[in-house]
């Protein structure tokens, strides 16, 4: 368990031409709030698909009223972090959607009106417990700057928050089989808390609250021997009473799965795949009806009104197995053409096409500029499977529809003066600076023979030395 934390640093006009109009006005003051939606894995799901990892809504920001004639500044933000708690393991790879919403506070009938200002999305890799990661995302002419991290809630630790830590019982070492809990070396890795009553000798768990039996034992708490021999568990821990550890058969030898179930080995024990009408660790439980809800992943249960008649699960797309328990990897058939990326969304298969290709399976080769109109005298320029508009003087944006003030975003660093020019903008740099936007000091330090700065260390703002 843990918490994903999102800190919004700024939301305002992005750099470059085409500064957006302020979302608020003197007549319609407004305030911002943000919504974050998290999904596991690197899937690029539709914005409206469920936020399986969780979602959060920020508080409302301060009320903002546009100053007439002033360019849209960075807008005032809500206080605090957006926090998305997650109950299970942190997946390591995740997709996010961050939405910026505007709440208008004018004289609307029926209270405030909400409208979506911008939506950014992305896919990232992130280890829990790491430092804040910074990001910049652009949505149209808006720019969102934010940081995020995932942290574990005690006693969970690790990059996936799956290891548990407890204070050491003895000062010098951890218990048998338990490692020190880096980076908390004064704590020890704790065993998972299994289902209450689960046999410590014959049961184990890979998830909190479960009880899985070692070979030779059964029952909900793994206290019932399958046979009278006390040495049926050659690969598990030795029996507490006999200390018996006889090298013996593998966990699937003799097929421990009853009622026609098929056995497969797992790292710790075995797993039975049961035929219809049976379930349990060894397929020993029968008489399942639809009332027991045996179909997983949204499968539809048919028949099985009484224990003597079998039920059938009709599985939704993307799942198979007698209980719809297995996910089908439909991407293994490589259905996407022309190097498209296959995304199995469960309910549908989607191809994310490379630039220059389109169609459900990326089968259509696009003429980049076909049907693309650039407004206000702009011309379409093809290249790399994408199109862009080369805009006439005074216009900008993807389709040259936005009136451009290239200096609105204050693009010149270190006190450089910005001038609008027919080719865009020109920065007139202060003495001692170079670069298209004056971002490079010619001599960044005043003293000679400065020692090398360690990585990431800032010797200081170059302006101080000139």
């Amino acid at each position: 368990a843990g918490v994903f934390e999102l800190q919004i640093h700024s939301f305002g006009p992005g750099p470059g031409p085409g500064a957006p109009r302020s979302p608020c006005s003197a007549r319609l003051p407004c305030r911002l709030f943000f919504r974050v939606c998290l999904k596991p894995g690197l899937s690029e799901e539709a914005a409206e698909s469920p936020c399986a990892l969780g979602a959060a809504l920020s508080a409302r920001g301060p009320v903002y009223t546009e100053q007439p004639g002033a360019p849209a500044p960075d807008l005032p933000l809500p206080d605090g972090l957006l926090q998305v708690p997650f109950r299970d393991a942190w997946p390591g790879t995740f997709s996010f959607i961050i939405e910026t919403w505007r709440e208008e506070l004018g004289d609307q009938i029926g209270g405030p009106a909400w409208s979506l200002l911008a939506r950014v999305a992305g896919r990232r890799r992130l280890a829990a417990g790491g430092p804040w990661a910074r990001d910049i995302q652009r949505a149209g002419a808006w720019e969102l700057r934010f940081s995020y991290r995932a942290r574990c809630e005690p006693p969970a630790v690790g990059t996936a928050c799956t290891r548990l830590c407890r204070p050491r019982s003895a000062p010098s070492r951890c218990g048998p089989g338990l490692r020190p809990c880096a980076p908390l070396e004064d704590e020890c890795e704790a065993p998972l808390v299994c289902r209450a009553g689960c046999s410590p000798e014959h049961g184990f768990c890979e998830q909190p609250g479960e009880c899985r039996c070692l070979e030779g034992w059964t029952g909900p708490l793994c206290t019932v021997p399958v046979s009278t021999s006390s040495c049926l568990s050659p690969r598990g821990p030795s029996s507490a009473t006999t200390g018996c550890l006889v090298p013996g058969p593998g966990p699937c030898d003799g097929n421990p799965c009853a009622n026609g179930g098929s056995c497969s080995e797992t790292p710790r024990s075995f797993e039975c795949t049961c035929p219809r009408g049976f379930y349990g660790l060894r397929c020993e439980v029968s008489g399942v009806t639809c009332a027991d809800g045996p179909c997983f992943n949204g499968g539809l249960c048919v028949g099985g009104a009484d224990p003597d008649s079998a039920y059938i699960c009709h599985c939704p797309p993307g799942f198979q197995g007698s209980n719809c328990e297995k996910r089908v990897d439909r991407c293994s058939l490589q259905p996407c053409r022309n190097g498209g990326l296959c995304l199995d969304l469960g309910h549908a298969l989607r191809c994310r096409c490379r630039a220059g290709f389109a169609g459900p399976r990326c089968e259509h080769d696009l003429d980049d500029c076909a049907g693309r109109a650039c407004a206000n005298g702009g011309t379409c320029v093809e290249g790399g499977g994408a199109h862009r508009c080369s805009c006439a003087l005074g216009f900008g944006g993807r389709d040259c529809r936005e009136r451009a003030d290239p200096c609105a975003a204050r693009p010149c660093a270190h006190g450089g003066r910005c001038y609008a020019h027919f080719s865009g903008l020109v920065c007139a740099c202060a003495p001692g600076y170079m670069g298209a936007r004056c971002e490079f000091p010619v001599h960044p330090d005043g003293a000679s023979a400065l020692p090398a700065a360690p990585p990431g260390l800032r010797p200081g703002d170059p302006q101080r030395y000139l």
């Epitope: 640093h9 990001d135 910049i136 490079f440 960044p444």
Partner: nanobody, 117 residues
């Protein structure tokens, strides 16, 4: 925080070539302006070449036509291709990043380039 790690320095003969690489830890490297600086013993650190976030480049006169700066945003890296090296190019070469989010400069630790026969 932007971490910068340079590599590729070493000993080369006059007239030889060398390529320096700088890897940035920043997740949005396309929004960094990056540059190479150098500092010879007993001298001030000076700009060699820079590449803005829009891809435009700048060079000091002493390296124009010999050095080329380039970037690969997909690899979070910036490169300095140095040809026709001279003894006076001997210095510690530093990677520099100007992060537009907070208008902050960041520096790498440096890599030594020695031009000598």
């Amino acid at each position: 925080e932007v971490q910068l790690v340079e590599s590729g320095g070493g000993l080369v003969q006059p007239g030889g070539s060398l390529t320096l690489s700088c890897a940035a830890s920043f997740s949005a490297v396309a929004y960094l302006s990056m540059a190479w600086y150098r500092q010879a013993p007993g001298k001030k650190r000076e700009l060699v070449a820079g590449i803005s976030d829009d891809g435009s480049t700048v060079y000091v006169d002493s390296v124009k036509g010999r050095f080329t700066i380039s970037r690969d945003n997909a690899k979070n890296s910036v490169y300095l291709q140095m040809n026709s090296l001279r003894a006076e190019d001997t210095a510690v070469y530093y990677c520099y990043a100007y992060e537009w989010t907070n208008a902050l400069p960041y520096w790498g630790q440096g890599t030594l380039v020695t031009v000598s026969s």
